[in-house]
């Protein structure tokens, strides 16, 4: 039960006090007791419940006519059952007794009022009055947890605006309101109560720039909203009429959880006694609601696809046709960024990551815009953000970034359980160097901090700086599977490729050509690839790098070898010993449900079929997956990327609610 104030009674004159329903009010009957008195009794109106405890050990007894010793060990508490119809209509009488004196009486006139701040602390999507029974001042995780949730109002419901909704002090319309969380103030008081009392709604100064609160004012024609709390206003005096009254507030978060902001925001209502104009206002009662800002959540390849994004660039019509066909098969919407908007930047995966935010009453896709800021710089903010599609970015917007800050270097695993610890929303994966050095690359700290601060998809740092481009999507992918954990981890594997080529040579196919049919590209015989000592050494190094990640992923995602599929792939070391795919990197694939868009490897054709394609199909088709090999050689591969790098996908949010997990 909520804590009320302490009331001191004195025999000299009647005491007037306010008691808020649902609170426990302490009664100090000792400090002003007549000197010769040694005991007391209490009588109260029917609407007041008095508890007397004499401890230790506490013997509790409800009031009657019995007397109690007058000593500091006696605790007297009051609660009220009903709100008062008029000021001071509930009475408590304390009688003091002494051996030689007649009883001395002290009178207390109580006004019972109902004041409660309610939000959706049960996470049902509805605001139910709590009558302060539940402690709203704490926020707890898990299926039995409680606490309200706020969304960062980061979409743009007004198409004529260039800013996010949370960047203005206005409520555009009912669409805008739906992105906010409802909070209701319920009051029941005597009619004249607010002539001597005031309610103030407030937020801590440290949190005022993270939240905005609008008050709904019901006019004759429509309801209007005006801002009452926010970055410029930490408190607001409320004009509340006496009697029974409900006031609605709409709350929006302005910031995502981050290093300097754990994501919790407390809104408090304070009841102030303003009866004595010559004295400062005194706090009578406070009620608070704690909100947690919904985290930004990534979706893994195992979530159903809803929309595919790609770029139109010079001569990639065939690539786009293949992606269009794949999207149609997967029943996905397709969005193409035209040449004039992408400014010859085709790397859609690197520019953004599409996740979502969720409250019990609303789910919103949110695009995380990377700070790489190349030709596609404007695409997320101009073409993706919009009504019910939010936007967030982090990191320096001008310089100070590396290739590892592109979001081909940001992936998320499907849900996993690791040594008994559940990650029902999976774990974020990003690439890093294996140790810091003068020229090593890492994802910008601001991005790492943001990802960690979301709490629900605890990040795993992988080693990717060995690659020229340096992205995790160059050596790993996830595909859905009908068995085991519901997915397989795909890893690029030079060892598996050498094994395949060796088998082909053993069967007399050593003259078969890699890159056959590609104009202007020097073709390579299987036997030459197998006999090239330098290429072997390079791939031995690459294998060690991938194996390091393999063990890391097994440990951090709780995987067994049978959860991993090796995809045959060769690499070559380029300048500064950085690796690039030797032929189109098949693991860099587009996953749309059971439809896979895989870079066409142009492997040696044996018995009319590319042996690399055949091998990959034999590994993935038993899982119910359909492989489509897409020619990206001249438009993507030779520019250091593949199908996954050149596409992006919005996926269905998890059915699991993030607040039901325990981070």
């Amino acid at each position: 039960m909520a804590q009320g104030t302490l009331i001191r009674v004195t025999p000299e004159q009647p005491t007037h006090a306010v008691c808020v329903l649902g609170t426990l009010t302490q009664l100090d009957i000792c400090s002003s007791a007549p000197e010769d008195c040694t005991s007391f009794s209490i009588n109260a109106s029917p609407g007041v419940v008095v508890d007397i405890a004499h401890g230790p050990p506490a013997k509790k007894k409800s009031t009657g006519s019995s007397t109690w010793p007058l000593d500091p060990g006696v605790e007297v508490t009051l609660t009220m059952k009903v709100a008062s119809g008029s000021t001071g209509d509930q009475k408590v009488q304390i009688s003091y007794y002494g051996p030689k004196t007649p009883p001395v009486k002290a009178l207390l006139y109580l006004t019972g009022v109902e004041i409660s701040l309610c939000a959706d602390i049960t996470r049902t999507g509805k605001v139910k009055p709590t009558r302060a029974v539940k402690d709203q001042r704490t926020w707890t995780w898990g299926p039995c947890g409680q606490g309200a949730i706020l969304l960062v109002n980061c979409d743009r419901d007004n198409l004529e605006s260039s800013a996010m909704d949370c960047e203005d002090d206005e409520v555009l319309d009912s669409e805008d309101l739906q992105d906010m969380s409802l909070m209701t103030l319920s009051t029941k008081t005597p009619k004249d109560f607010f002539t001597n009392h005031t309610l103030v709604l407030h937020v801590a100064r440290s949190e005022m720039d993270k939240v905005r609160v609008f008050q709904a004012t019901r006019g004759k024609l429509s309801s209007k909203c005006s801002v009452v709390l926010g970055p410029k206003w930490p408190s607001h005096y409320l004009m509340v009429p006496g009697g029974k009254h409900n006031m609605d507030f709409y709350v929006e978060a302005l910031a995502f959880p981050d290093t300097d902001f754990p994501g919790l925001i407390t809104l408090t209502i304070s009841l102030l006694d303003t009866s004595n104009l010559e004295l400062p206002e005194a706090v009578v009662f406070q009620d608070s609601v704690v909100f947690r800002v919904a985290p930004w959540i990534m979706t893994p390849n195992t979530q159903p696809p809803q929309e595919v994004y790609a770029c139109s660039i010079f001569e990639n019509e065939d690539f786009l046709k293949s992606v269009t066909t794949l999207a149609m098969k997967a029943k996905c919407k397709l969005t193409i960024c035209p040449e004039e908007e992408n400014m010859d930047d085709q790397w859609m995966q690197d520019e953004m990551e599409i996740g979502y935010i969720q409250a019990p009453h609303k789910t919103l896709p949110v695009v995380f815009d990377s700070p790489r800021n190349r030709g596609l710089k404007e695409f997320p903010i101009k073409r993706v953000m919009g009504p019910d599609f939010g936007y967030v970015t982090r990191g320096p917007q001008t310089g100070g970034i590396s290739g590892l800050d592109s979001f081909g270097n940001l992936e998320v695993s499907p849900p996993v359980t690791v040594r008994g610890k559940e990650y029902p929303l999976g774990r974020i994966l990003f690439g890093d160097s294996c140790y810091p050095s003068n020229d090593s690359r890492q994802m910008h700290q601001a991005l790492q901090d943001f990802l960690s601060a979301q709490q629900v998809q605890a990040p795993v740092k992988l080693y990717s700086d060995w690659l020229s481009v340096g992205h995790v999507d160059e050596f790993l992918s996830f595909v859905p599977a009908p068995d085991r954990k519901g997915f397989r981890l795909l890893l690029a594997s030079p060892r598996s490729c050498y094994k395949l080529f060796q088998e082909q040579q053993n069967e007399g196919h050593g003259e078969a050509l890699l890159f056959e049919g590609i104009k202007k590209k020097k073709q390579q015989k299987i036997k030459n690839i197998l006999s090239n000592k330098t290429l072997r050494e390079h791939n031995s190094f690459v294998e060690r790098c991938i194996d390091w990640n393999r063990e890391l992923l097994k440990r951090e995602l709780g995987l067994a070898e049978s959860d991993i599929i090796d995809i045959p792939q060769l690499f070559k070391l380029k300048e500064f010993s950085k690796a690039e795919a030797f032929f189109p990197n098949m693991v860099n694939m587009l996953v749309l449900g059971k439809h896979l868009g895989i870079p066409k490897p142009f492997g040696p054709v044996i018995n009319g079929r590319c042996c690399l394609e055949e091998k990959v199909c034999s590994l993935l088709e038993p899982l119910g997956l359909q492989c489509t090999f897409i020619n990206d050689f001249f438009t993507y591969h030779i520019r250091h990327g593949e199908v996954h790098c050149g596409t992006n996908v919005r996926r269905k949010p998890f059915s699991f609610k993030w607040w039901n997990m325990v981070p």
Epitope: G470, I529, H538, K572, F576, R639
Partner: antibody, heavy 128, light 111 residues
Framework: QVQLVESGGGLVKPGGSLRLSCAAS????????VSWIRQAPGKGLEWVSF????????YYADSVRGRFTISRDNAKNSVYLQMNSLRAEDTAVYYC?????????????????????WGRGTLVTVSS | QSALTQPRSVSGSPGQSVTISCTGT?????????VSWYQQHPGKAPKLIIY???ERPSGVPDRFSGSKSGNTASLTISGLQAEDEADYYC???????????FGGGTKLTVL
Amino acid sequence: QVQLVESGGGLVKPGGSLRLSCAASGSTLSDYFVSWIRQAPGKGLEWVSFISSANTFTYYADSVRGRFTISRDNAKNSVYLQMNSLRAEDTAVYYCSSANDDVDDIVAPGRGYYMDVWGRGTLVTVSS
Amino acid sequence: QSALTQPRSVSGSPGQSVTISCTGTSGDVGRYNHVSWYQQHPGKAPKLIIYNVYERPSGVPDRFSGSKSGNTASLTISGLQAEDEADYYCSSHSRSSTPVLFGGGTKLTVL
């Protein structure tokens, strides 16, 4: 064959900044590794910085690391060297140089370590 | 002081051969086959004449040849001609924190 032209040099006070540009013509610079090399008056060549063709990694000489930043804008067919906290010892002719990354051999690293195309250079003088 | 050591000057008569040495360490010249040589005439930009120890770019006469033994690389110019008079610089990839090193340069005089 690509041709390179440097610009942006000039006189600057110690502690000041300059931004050098290297503009390419005759070919697409995105197919090339690019390095900046400098030569102090009457002295030898000193390698300064490197950027990969894919714009994915960069390297610096110890003498400039933390003060200089190399970047590229493939859409503008240009590479830049942002020079901050300049010192008297940074006075030199700055050359932009490149090597083609379009190699067909099975393995052919090394093209980022030599420079087969050079610009004419731009003079940077740091003096109070 | 340069990281790779070259003689300050060499000279030879037309038609003769000269060799310019470039000494590094086991962390640069000795470790990598990424040694290159540049020719620079006064007031001009350098020009690549040898890369990957011994390879010649197209257009460079075969009078120029490169080799390497241990931590020392060498540039040999046979059949010296007057237009060969210039400064010559060697360069190597390095394991050090500065990944490309140059020699201090050698002035070749054709007598």
